[in-house]
């Protein structure tokens, strides 16, 4: 009922075709020392098989190069095969600033990240850099900040601003798209001792983002001319029973608690959504919860309001929801929402339902509520058990991109990019990657390549072309040189 026939058409010429990776752990030393050692060795191949240094001989060395990092070489090979125009990856805050402040800057880590960006640019691949990407097992904070109460401590927001400033300064000449924080609206999974913990941590995350954005706007934008936002987890919600009013209300409430919670203060009013504040207050009045959203001062509202240059959404699936009154003072119970798994739907091994039309509804809802701004889908993908012919991923990509195209062509949503999640999978984690954990390519890569080179799903005889300046053209000489580099 919700699906509409596929459309034929193309995305705009300046559309970003991306792939997302989570945190890149920096290599501490270049893994190819053979070019920086000035000594000559003789290899005793038939005897003890050891290298013996020849004294008194010094060879000319060459300067260290970015591709001395084995990890970078691997990434470049994968990215070159993906044919993407953009690569989204996250820095490791704890590696860059182990002490949590600028007293000890890990220059080697910053050099590594600069190498990732600059080598990508040689392939015609621009970076979208995420400053802070908390993973649920590990908060990704520098140890001293973690031990000082993490995001429950307002000073963490100031520490984040200092870290962001360092990254803007060191990488900003090469990076034009920044994400401050990935999915702050999902940190409720960690700060879940009470609703007040959740809302307090969220408040400090909002402030941290706003401080970083204001710093960029004031100090770096004039020269670097980049754009800064934060990525929100943004699954769509549908009423489990479309004939029940309470389910419709629950679906809207899910969106308010999940997306508007962060979007409203930043994109619109500088304050939390009235619907969310009122719902929590009403439960509080009835003695069903002791939670309360923080009261914002006028100064805080001014600080938060308007601190986004674009809207960044991570969208994976659609959830079917119903109303269920829950007691307790935690974020999950404050929403009064129960999720239903529809077993008739095509789903992944981690039970992510494939519901393509949800992304179009989401984009329409965002546009309707927050205005006609540039929107990037900064992560979207599915786990697929297959190690070679990942048909579920191909189906997912094709259908979800169709719905994004409808949002652009028909709903006139200003969609600027789609970043597939993710580049390579991690061992013993759900298989979201286009490459296996030992870097073997899957067949979905060719599918994504085809969509990228066609700029979507064009008519057979489509004459639509982009001028050279608009379209990202691959430099074959650069590619050749990169592949031949040691």
């Amino acid at each position: 009922k919700e699906s509409t026939p596929d459309v034929q058409g193309q995305f705009p010429c300046d559309f970003s075709w991306g792939v997302t990776e989570s945190v890149l752990k920096p290599e501490s030393v270049a893994s190819s020392p053979q070019f920086s050692d000035p000594h000559l060795y003789v290899w005793n191949a038939t005897g003890n098989r050891l290298l013996h240094r020849v004294e008194g001989v010094r060879l000319k060395t060459r300067p260290a190069q970015c591709t001395d990092f084995v990890n970078i070489k691997k990434q470049l090979e994968m990215l070159a095969r993906m044919k993407v125009t953009h690569y989204r990856f996250a820095l490791d805050w704890a590696s860059v600033l182990p002490t949590g402040n600028l007293s000890a800057v890990n220059r080697q880590a910053l050099r590594y990240y600069r190498c990732v960006v600059s080598e990508g640019l040689k392939l015609g691949i621009s970076a979208m850099v995420t400053l802070y990407y908390p993973t649920h097992a590990h908060l990704g904070l520098p140890e001293p900040l973690l031990h000082a109460d993490g995001w429950l401590n307002p000073s963490t927001a100031e520490a984040f601003q200092a870290y962001a400033g360092l990254c803007f300064q060191e990488l900003g000449d090469l990076v034009k798209l920044w994400i401050t924080i990935n999915e702050p609206n999902r940190l409720s999974d960690i700060y879940n001792r009470s609703g007040n913990d959740t809302y307090g941590a969220a408040h400090n995350l909002l402030v941290a983002h706003a401080l970083a954005w204001r710093l960029y706007d004031r100090q770096f934008r004039p020269s670097q001319r980049g754009a800064v936002s934060l990525s929100l987890h943004a699954d769509w919600a549908e009423p489990a029973n479309p004939y029940a009013d309470s389910h419709w209300r629950a679906a809207e409430r899910f969106l308010q608690f999940e997306i508007a919670w962060f979007a409203e203060p930043l994109f619109k009013t500088g304050d939390y959504p009235a619907a969310m504040r009122e719902y929590i207050a009403s439960k509080h009045r009835r003695g069903l919860s002791s939670s309360a959203l923080p009261r914002l001062t006028e100064a805080e509202r001014r600080l938060l309001k308007g601190t986004v240059d674009f809207c960044a959404l991570n969208h994976f699936t659609t959830r079917f929801v119903m109303h269920e009154q829950l007691a307790g003072s935690r974020y999950d119970s404050d929403r009064d929402i129960q999720f239903l798994q529809d077993i008739t739907r095509l789903s992944s091994p981690t039970r992510l339902a494939v519901i393509p039309w949800g992304v179009r509804k989401l984009l329409r809802w965002v546009r309707r509520n927050y205005g006609d701004m540039d929107i990037y889908i900064t992560a979207s993908g599915i786990d697929d058990q297959a190690l070679e012919d990942d048909r579920l991923r191909k189906y997912y990509l094709g259908k979800y991109l169709q719905e994004v195209l409808k949002a652009y062509l028909i709903d006139k949503v200003r969609i600027k990019g789609y970043y597939a999640f993710k580049l390579a999978e991690e061992k013993s984690k759900p298989r979201f990657g286009f490459f296996t954990s030992d870097f073997k390519a899957k067949s979905s890569i060719q599918f994504y390549n085809k969509v990228i080179s066609s700029r979507g799903f064009p008519f057979e005889n489509s004459s639509s072309r982009c001028s050279q300046t608009q379209e990202n053209t691959e430099c074959t000489v650069c590619l050749f040189l990169v592949q031949k580099k040691p």
Epitope: K1, E2, T4, P5, V7, G9, Q10, P12, C13, D14, R364, R368, D372, L409, I410, D411, K412, R414, R455, S464, R465, C466, Q470
Partner: antibody
Framework: EVKFLESGGGLVQPGGSLRLSCAVS????????MSWVRQAPGKGLEWIGE????????NYTPSLKDKFVISRDNAKNTLYLQMSKVRSADTALYYC?????????WGQGTLVTVSA | DIVMTQSPATLSVTPGDRVSLSCRAS??????VYWYQQKSHESPRLLII???QSISGIPSRFSGSGSGSDFTLSINSVEPEDVGVYYC?????????FGGGTKLEIK
């Protein structure tokens, strides 16, 4: 204030050609899709077609695809409709409008009369 | 192409009446219907998007409903300035066809 100002209408002979223009002010023209709609005297509205912000996508109503060409010049904030092989059935008031996605801003229209 | 059929063609009403204008699509178009009002010698004006969502600046007496293939524009308490022709439009897929219009006149 948002303004859409159509021009270029007038009397044209059957089989002839005409280029209509729509000058836009008050919005960031280069960021928006634009449409043409026409209305024959005493009749209803007919959607002609639309063009994307970067001109890479242009959609037409199938019956008019071969005789009308929509284009735009973002530097001049202007939308165009090139009409060719006109017939008396093309006599109408031609409006430019912004689809976002419904047509929320309209010009006053320019009248095209096809007559020998 | 999706055909949009409006009824009635003409509607004569008394100020203060509640009126309903109907629009039927030749196939299901979810909630992709837009309503416009066109007064004599004026350009059309957008009233409702996505079948039921109101537009800022439009009087609250105008409301829309429907989903699938049957849609209704309601005017809660008709005022003399509401005279004109009302059009529905398919916004589901191109070509974005219009209905033939319903002319609203005051008795």
């Amino acid at each position: 204030e948002v303004k859409f100002l159509e021009s270029g209408g007038g009397l044209v002979q059957p089989g002839g050609s005409l280029r209509l223009s729509c000058a836009v002010s008050g919005i960031d023209f280069s960021r928006y899709w634009m449409s043409w709609v026409r209305q024959a005297p005493g009749k209803g509205l007919e959607w002609i077609g639309e063009i994307s912000p970067d001109s890479s996508t242009i959609n037409y109503t199938p019956s008019l695809k071969d005789k009308f060409v929509i284009s735009r010049d973002n530097a001049k904030n202007t939308l165009y409709l090139q009409m060719s092989k006109v017939r008396s059935a093309d006599t109408a008031l031609y409006y430019c409008a912004r689809p976002s996605p419904a047509l929320d801003y309209w010009g006053q229209g320019t009248l095209v009369t096809v007559s020998a | 192409d999706i055909v949009m059929t409006q009824s009635p063609a003409t509607l004569s009403v008394t100020p203060g009446d509640r009126v309903s204008l109907s629009c039927r699509a030749s196939q299901s178009i979810s909630d992709y219907v837009y309503w416009y009002q066109q007064k004599s010698h004026e350009s059309p004006r957008l009233l409702i998007i996505y079948a039921s969502q109101s537009i800022s600046g439009i009087p609250s007496r105008f409301s829309g409903s429907g989903s699938g293939s049957d849609f209704t524009l309601s005017i809660n308490s008709v005022e003399p300035e509401d005279v004109g022709v009302y059009y529905c439009q398919n916004g589901h897929n191109f070509p974005y066809t219009f209905g033939g219009g319903t002319k609203l006149e005051i008795k």
